[in-house]
């Protein structure tokens, strides 16, 4: 139920990558505005994005306080210009979001190969340790800081002259692989959290190949 000139939000959806977390919903407002509230299961409601005509609300600042908590959000609908108005039950119209646990559900962003260095028949490939908006002691944590050994990287590599790929894994951000001397190789990496059941894998990084500026070669 609710007032005749407001409709409840629907399709509440969490969009989250590397903990940057936005709640989206429908419909586009016509003569109404929205306010969002967020809470942990045991916590108090905190209001965000007051009386907005947007259909999204950035909740990153709230969820990064404890990424292992489970959060619930709700979106209130108010008539534009009359935000004191309530539904027929004496409270504003609202809709609940699905529950969201950032540590288990945030999407893994596309990783980036930071560098590769060849020494003889070995190549060291380093994956950029992306900074997140999660803080500890006033500093921003990297993806590795947050996930620790729960996060692994899969490396795909192949000779530039051939299509046959090989793969290796690391639970750090570095790979040390054997290569054939005198051959150029291309590399791509993917982030994976094996313990998850959803949003387990990132998309592949852009391909980087030897003979381009990211690499370094030493005999």
């Amino acid at each position: 139920s609710g007032t005749t000139n407001t409709v409840a939000a629907y399709n509440l959806t969490w969009k989250s990558t590397n903990f940057k977390t936005i709640l989206e919903w429908e419909p586009k407002p016509v003569n109404q505005v929205y306010t969002v509230q967020i809470s942990t299961k045991s916590g108090d409601w905190k209001s965000k994005c007051f009386y907005t005509t947007d259909t999204e609300c950035d909740l990153t600042d709230e969820i990064v306080k404890d990424v292992k908590q489970t959060y619930l959000a709700r979106v209130f609908s108010y008539p534009a210009g009359n935000v004191e108005s309530t539904g027929s039950a004496g409270e504003p119209l609202y809709e609940n979001s699905p529950e969201f646990t950032p540590y288990l559900e945030t999407n893994l962003g596309q990783p980036t190969i930071q560098s590769f260095e060849q020494v003889g028949t070995k190549v060291n490939v380093t994956v950029e340790d992306e900074r997140t908006l999660v803080r500890r002691n006033n500093t921003f944590l990297s993806l590795r800081d947050v996930f620790g050994k729960d996060l692994i990287y899969t490396l795909y590599y192949w000779k530039s002259s051939s299509s046959g790929k090989k793969t290796a894994k690391t639970n750090t951000n570095e790979f040390l692989i054997d290569v054939d001397k005198g051959e150029n190789y291309c590399f791509s990496v993917q982030a994976v959290i094996p313990s998850r059941t959803v949003n387990r894998k990132s998309t592949d990084s852009p391909v980087e190949c030897m003979g381009q500026e990211k690499g370094e070669f030493r005999e």
């Epitope: 795909y156 790929k165 290796a168 894994k169 993917q190 094996p194 059941t197």
Partner: antibody, heavy 117, light 107 residues
Framework: EVQLVESGGGLVQPGGSLRLSCAAS????????MHWWRQAPGKGLEWVGL????????IYDPKFQDRATISADNSKNTAYLQMNSLRAEDTAVYYC??????????LGQGTLVTVSS | DIQMTQSPSSLSASVGDRVTITCRAS??????LNWYQQKPGKAPKVLIY???SLAEGVPSRFSGSGSGTDYTLTISSLQPEDFATYYC?????????AGQGTKVEIK
């Protein structure tokens, strides 16, 4: 409940081809890596290759690189193994497996391929 | 390719015995080592992953240890249902490779 069901095995002539299917239920194959293994009668486990169904990456044991093709149809939640130029030593039970990236947590029951004239 | 050498290839033991199976990799596999159990006519089943982690639903009498190139599977007190073939398997880099298996038989 997670299940993997292989099919497509049977008797194949030397020089012939096979196409095995691995139908998955209880999970989305795009979230995992899917592998194919085989085991010749009385022998150990031999890895054929893998696919990341979401990204399309495939990796093969070099000994199968020229004869094996692994693919996936995400809409059918099914992985496939095509092998060509079959010989007697390819006679084996072929298994598909779900890989979490930490381990293969589910394997199918296997499908027997016999290469004989 | 990484070679996995498993020993012994077979052993006879009695119920209640402590059983140890070893696996040696031809180079450091950084604990990307899993142990599988296989019974006749059945698919392999994971016991241990990352060298030391017990897979879900696996009895605590199974344990794994090791690092670098040398790994061990221990069954602290062999049960009747443990008579089977055991394989170690490395998954740190392709091609994935398995040991040749250890058949645990009743003495």
């Amino acid at each position: 409940e997670v299940q993997l069901v292989e099919s497509g095995g049977g008797l194949v002539q030397p020089g012939g081809s096979l196409r095995l299917s691995c139908a998955a239920s209880g999970f989305n194959i795009k979230e995992y890596y899917m592998h194919w293994w085989r085991q010749a009668p009385g022998k150990g486990l031999e890895w054929v290759g893998l696919i990341d169904p979401e990204q399309g990456n495939t990796i093969y044991d070099p000994k199968f690189q020229d004869r094996a093709t692994i693919s996936a149809d995400n809409s059918k939640n099914t992985a496939y193994l095509q092998m060509n130029s079959l010989r007697a030593e390819d006679t084996a039970v072929y298994y598909c497996a779900r890989d979490t990236a930490a381990y293969w947590d589910y394997l199918g029951q296997g499908t027997l391929v016999t290469v004989s004239s | 390719d990484i070679q996995m050498t498993q020993s012994p290839s077979s052993l006879s033991a009695s119920v209640g015995d402590r059983v140890t199976i070893t696996c040696r990799a031809s180079r450091d596999i950084k604990s990307y080592l899993n142990w599988y159990q296989q019974k006749p006519g059945k698919a392999p089943k994971v016991l241990i992953y990352y060298a030391t982690s017990l897979a879900e639903g696996v009895p605590s009498r199974f344990s794994g240890s090791g690092s670098g190139t040398d790994y061990t599977l221990t069954i602290s007190s062999l049960q009747p249902e443990d008579f089977a073939t055991y394989y170690c398997l490395q998954h740190g880099e392709s091609p994935w490779t398995a040991g040749q298996g250890t058949k645990v038989e009743i003495k």
